[in-house]
Interface confidence: low
């Protein structure tokens, strides 16, 4: 069974978390977005979403990067910094962000009821919207065998974590990995939770 927690869409960009923890590889992220009739957002698309109110406290894939969008400074989220944070060492599993080009240009909180591009498969997939509504379907979206049959069978049991790295600026972005948390192998969010993604300072 796979639970997919999704947020509202902001200029088409939304956050997806699998099984309440960081548990999505880059290849699975692309497949997952495709199943949502979406793609991995570009940095420009993420910045647009940020500009109209999209923020999370979870690392997720976009095209070429792993990021957290932050609007409001929060001492326990990205050390009070704001902007699109890029994780410099992306060797783990994370959540993902997706971009749906046909979504409204502003905020869209209507419920997502299915994975329109999922194909036939045996997996029970539950879509959990931010308001708690749940929609269940059978199917599959993963195409990479390594995502379907992970080498570490305990990944689905892993808890969340934190990340910490020193921050520096480059190219207009702040490169940041959390300080005071774990790298979660996963959780429920734009959401920091108790599952596995702390990334320590370097």
């Amino acid at each position: 069974q796979i639970d997919l927690n999704i947020t509202c869409r902001f200029a088409g960009v939304f956050h997806v978390e699998k099984n309440g923890r960081y548990s999505i590889s880059r290849t699975e992220a692309a497949d997952l977005c495709k199943a949502f009739n979406s793609t991995l957002p570009t940095m420009a698309q993420m910045e647009k979403a940020l500009s109209i109110g999209f923020e999370t406290c979870r690392y997720g894939f976009i095209e070429g990067h792993v990021v957290i969008p932050r609007i409001h400074p929060n001492s326990i989220c990205a050390a009070n910094n704001t902007g699109v944070y890029i994780l410099t060492s992306n060797t783990s599993q994370y959540d993902t962000y997706c971009f749906n080009a046909s979504a409204p240009p502003e905020e869209d909180c209507t419920s997502v009821t299915d994975l329109p591009n999922a194909f036939d498969g045996p997996i029970t997939i539950t879509i959990v919207n931010r308001d708690g509504t749940r929609y269940v379907q059978k199917g599959e979206y993963r195409t990479n065998p390594e995502d379907i049959y992970p080498s570490n069978p305990t990944d689905d049991d892993v808890s969340s974590g934190s990340s910490s790295e020193r921050s520096s600026t480059s190219g207009g972005y702040i490169f940041y990995t959390f300080s005071t948390v774990h790298p979660i192998p996963d959780e429920d969010s734009p959401w920091i939770t108790d599952s596995t993604d702390r990334i320590p300072a370097t």
């Epitope: 309440g20 989220c77 934190s162 959390f178």
Partner: antibody
Framework: EVQLLESGGGLVQPGGSLRLSCAAS????????MRWVRQAPGKGLEWVSS????????EYADSVKGRFTISRDNSKNTLYLQMNSLRAEDTAVYYC???????????WGQGTLVTVSS | DIQMTQSPLSLPVTPGEPASISCRSS???????????LDWYLQKPGQSPQLLIY???NRASGVPDRFSGSGSGTDFTLKISRVEAEDVGVYYC?????????FGQGTKLEIK
């Protein structure tokens, strides 16, 4: 400043019920996973339950599964623990804690004492 | 469930001297992402627990650098380079690899 304030503890008879609350302030409550951890008098720490930011995912220790229910009201910035069919061994100080990452409980409340006795 | 075992359970230390606490898990806490899901907490007398070390070796915000964590897999160590009076309390290790999160029995550090 992050603050977590537990309430609802007290004396209850075996088999009784109690609802603990944890009022959160100083951070964006709806973004974070929360948990309950307890400590029996003179004993060590025991994880009780966790809940994801939206409340969609909950987890429980085997010792409380089926008896305790964790929930949250993000509009009220409040975490709850509904405890039913209480037993003497549930006697403990119950802490709510904010998770800021994998398993990390960086902020804890001051705790509320639950005493189960006849 | 993953079992956590700490030693010693009691640790009398002279101020200024080093201290070391061991924590062993019943199965490896090393995740495939390269991180060890092991935390250390300190509970001072009459207070709530506070996070000292996360992911085996990373100091939480505000924790003095005299505290350090090390180890990998199933064997971990918390070291205090020079114990101060304010360090008294009970130290707990906790595995965060999988639920149920489990704690060690605790090590009570006291000043000689």
């Amino acid at each position: 400043e992050v603050q977590l304030l537990e309430s609802g503890g007290g004396l209850v008879q075996p088999g009784g019920s109690l609802r603990l609350s944890c009022a959160a302030s100083g951070f964006t409550f709806s973004l974070y996973r929360m948990r309950w951890v307890r400590q029996a008098p003179g004993k060590g720490l025991e994880w009780v339950s966790s809940i994801s930011p939206s409340g969609g995912i909950t987890e429980y220790a085997d010792s409380v599964k089926g008896r305790f229910t964790i929930s949250r009201d993000n509009s009220k910035n409040t975490l709850y623990l509904q405890m039913n069919s209480l037993r003497a061994e549930d006697t403990a100080v119950y802490y709510c804690a904010l998770d800021v990452g994998v398993g990390a409980a960086d902020y804890w409340g001051q705790g509320t004492l639950v005493t189960v006795s006849s | 469930d993953i079992q956590m075992t700490q030693s010693p359970l009691s640790l009398p230390v002279t101020p200024g001297e080093p201290a070391s606490i061991s924590c062993r898990s019943s199965q490896s806490l090393l995740h495939s992402n390269g991180y060890n899901y092991l935390d250390w907490y300190l509970q001072k007398p009459g207070q709530s627990p506070q996070l000292l070390i996360y992911l085996g070796s990373n100091r939480a915000s505000g924790v003095p650098d005299r505290f350090s964590g090390s180890g990998s897999g199933t064997d971990f160590t918390l070291k205090i380079s020079r114990v101060e009076a304010e360090d008294v309390g009970v130290y707990y290790c906790m595995q965060a690899l999988q639920t149920p999160w489990t704690f060690g029995q605790g090590t009570k550090l006291e000043i000689k």
